[in-house]
Amino acid sequence: MAVTACQGLGFVVSLIGIAGIIAATCMDQWSTQDLYNNPVTAVFNYQGLWRSCVRESSGFTECRGYFTLLGLPAMLQAVRALMIVGIVLGAIGLLVSIFALKCIRIGSMEDSAKANMTLTSGIMFIVSGLCAIAGVSVFANMLVTNFWMSTANMYTGMGGMVQTVQTRYTFGAALFVGWVAGGLTLIGGVMMCIACRGLAPEETNYKAVSYHASGHSVAYKPGGFKASTGFGSNTKNKKIYDGGARTEDEVQSYPSKHDYV
C-alpha cells in the first residue's frame, strides 16, 4: 500500500513538475526590467527564451520573436536546449510511469517489469528536473553577470548631453517557476526510485544445504548456492530483482527515446 502511494505521489509530483517546466519554457518573463530606481515606467521590458516584449503604460503589449538562430547568444541556445531536453525526458518518463503504476493492470505484466519501468521513469524524472534546474540557473547566472555589467556602465554619454540608459534586467517569474518545477520533477523522480525498491519481490531463493552423515565423511549436495550465482535451475522460474541487473530469462523492452528538439 505504501509503495503504491509512494509511486502514485511520485507520478503526480513529477506530472506537476513537468507541467511547470513546460510553462516556464513557454513563459515570456524569464527576465524583467529592473524597476529598483523607477518603480513606475511608461515602457516595461521583459524577455523570454523565444521572444522579448514591451508592456506600455497605455496598456498595449507587443512582443517580438527572436527570428534568428545564429545571432542569438550561445548561452540562450544552451538554456533552450536544456529546457527542451528536460521536457522530452519528462514526457517520456511520464509515458513510461503510466504503464508502471501499480494501480494500473496491463495484461499480465509482472511486478519486476513494473519495478524496472518505475526505476526508468524515476531516473528520467531526475535527469529532467536537473536539466530544468541547470537551464534556469545558467540563465540566472547570465542575468546576474549582465546586471552588474550594465550597472557599471549605466550611462554612456555623448558629449555629456545625450545619455543612453541601458535597460537592466532582473529575475523574471519564469525562473522561479522553473526552479520549483525542476525541484518537483526531481523529488517525483526520487520517489519513483524509492517506490521501485518496494515493487520488486524481495525473496532470497536459497536452497537448503543437505548434510548426509555417512561415517565420518561429510558430503555437500551440489548446486547449493545456485540462486545467488544466477546459474543452474530455478525451478519456480521467479524473476529476482537485483537493482537493475536482469536474469537471462528476463526480457525487458525499454521505450525508444526520440529527442525532437
Epitope: V40, V43, N45, S52, C53, V54, S58, E62, R64, Q163
Partner: antibody, heavy 118, light 113 residues
Framework: QVQLQQPGAELVRPGTSVKLSCKAS????????VNWVKQRPGQGLEWIGM????????RLNQQFKDKATLTVDKSSNTAYMQLNRPTSEDSAVYYC???????????WGQGTTLIVSS | DIVMTQSPSSLTVTAGEKVTLNCLSS????????????LTWYQQKPGQPPKLLIY???TRDSGVPDRFTGGGSGVDFTLTIYRVQAEDLAFYYC?????????FGSGTKLEMK
Amino acid sequence: QVQLQQPGAELVRPGTSVKLSCKASGYSFTNYWVNWVKQRPGQGLEWIGMVHPSGSETRLNQQFKDKATLTVDKSSNTAYMQLNRPTSEDSAVYYCARVWSGNAFDYWGQGTTLIVSS
Amino acid sequence: DIVMTQSPSSLTVTAGEKVTLNCLSSQSLLASGNQRNYLTWYQQKPGQPPKLLIYWASTRDSGVPDRFTGGGSGVDFTLTIYRVQAEDLAFYYCQNGFSFPFTFGSGTKLEMK
C-alpha cells in the same frame, strides 16, 4: 466615432479650486488611459498626468503633484481634473486626450480655456 | 526627465518642397523589448488641439497622408514632409513616450513664404 468633449472655458478666482471635465464617447471608456495636457498661450505642451478609468489609477507629473488631482466617474464616462489653489500661472488651455499604442495621444478634446482672474 | 529639443524653431517653406524637422532626445527612446522608438509627432493648427501624425517614430496614424514620414532611432529623430502643402502650415511637436513624465519638444513652426 471617438469623441472627448470639454467645456469651452472656465473662469475662476485665484485660490478657488476648479474641476475640469472631459466626457468620453464612442469607445470603451474603461480600456484606455485619459491624459491631461496644459498649453499656456503661445507656449508648448506640458504633460500633467493620466488616469485609468477602470481602477482610477493615476500617473502624475511631479511638477503638478500638488496642483492637480485626477479622478473619473465611470457611470458618466467622464474624467476630471481638479486644479487646487489656481494662480494666474494656471491660466491656460487644458486638453484631455486618450492614450494609444506607443504611449501616443490619438484623440484630443477641444480643450478648456481656464482663466484665473480676480 | 527626458528633454526634447526641436530644431529649427521656425521654418519658412514654399509649396511643393521637401521639409525636414528635427527632434533630439536627451536619452535613448529605444525599448529593448520590441526594438521600437517611443517618439511621437503631432501637428497643431491655431485654435485646434494637437493631431497625432506619427507614433513609434515611424508609424503613421490612420488617415495621415503618406507625405508625412518619420525616421530616426535612439536619440535623433526626423519628421519629413514631402511636397509641402498650404494645409501643412502649423506647429509640429515631438513627444517622448518612453518614460514618465511624458515630455514635449518646444515645437517647430512651419510658415509659408
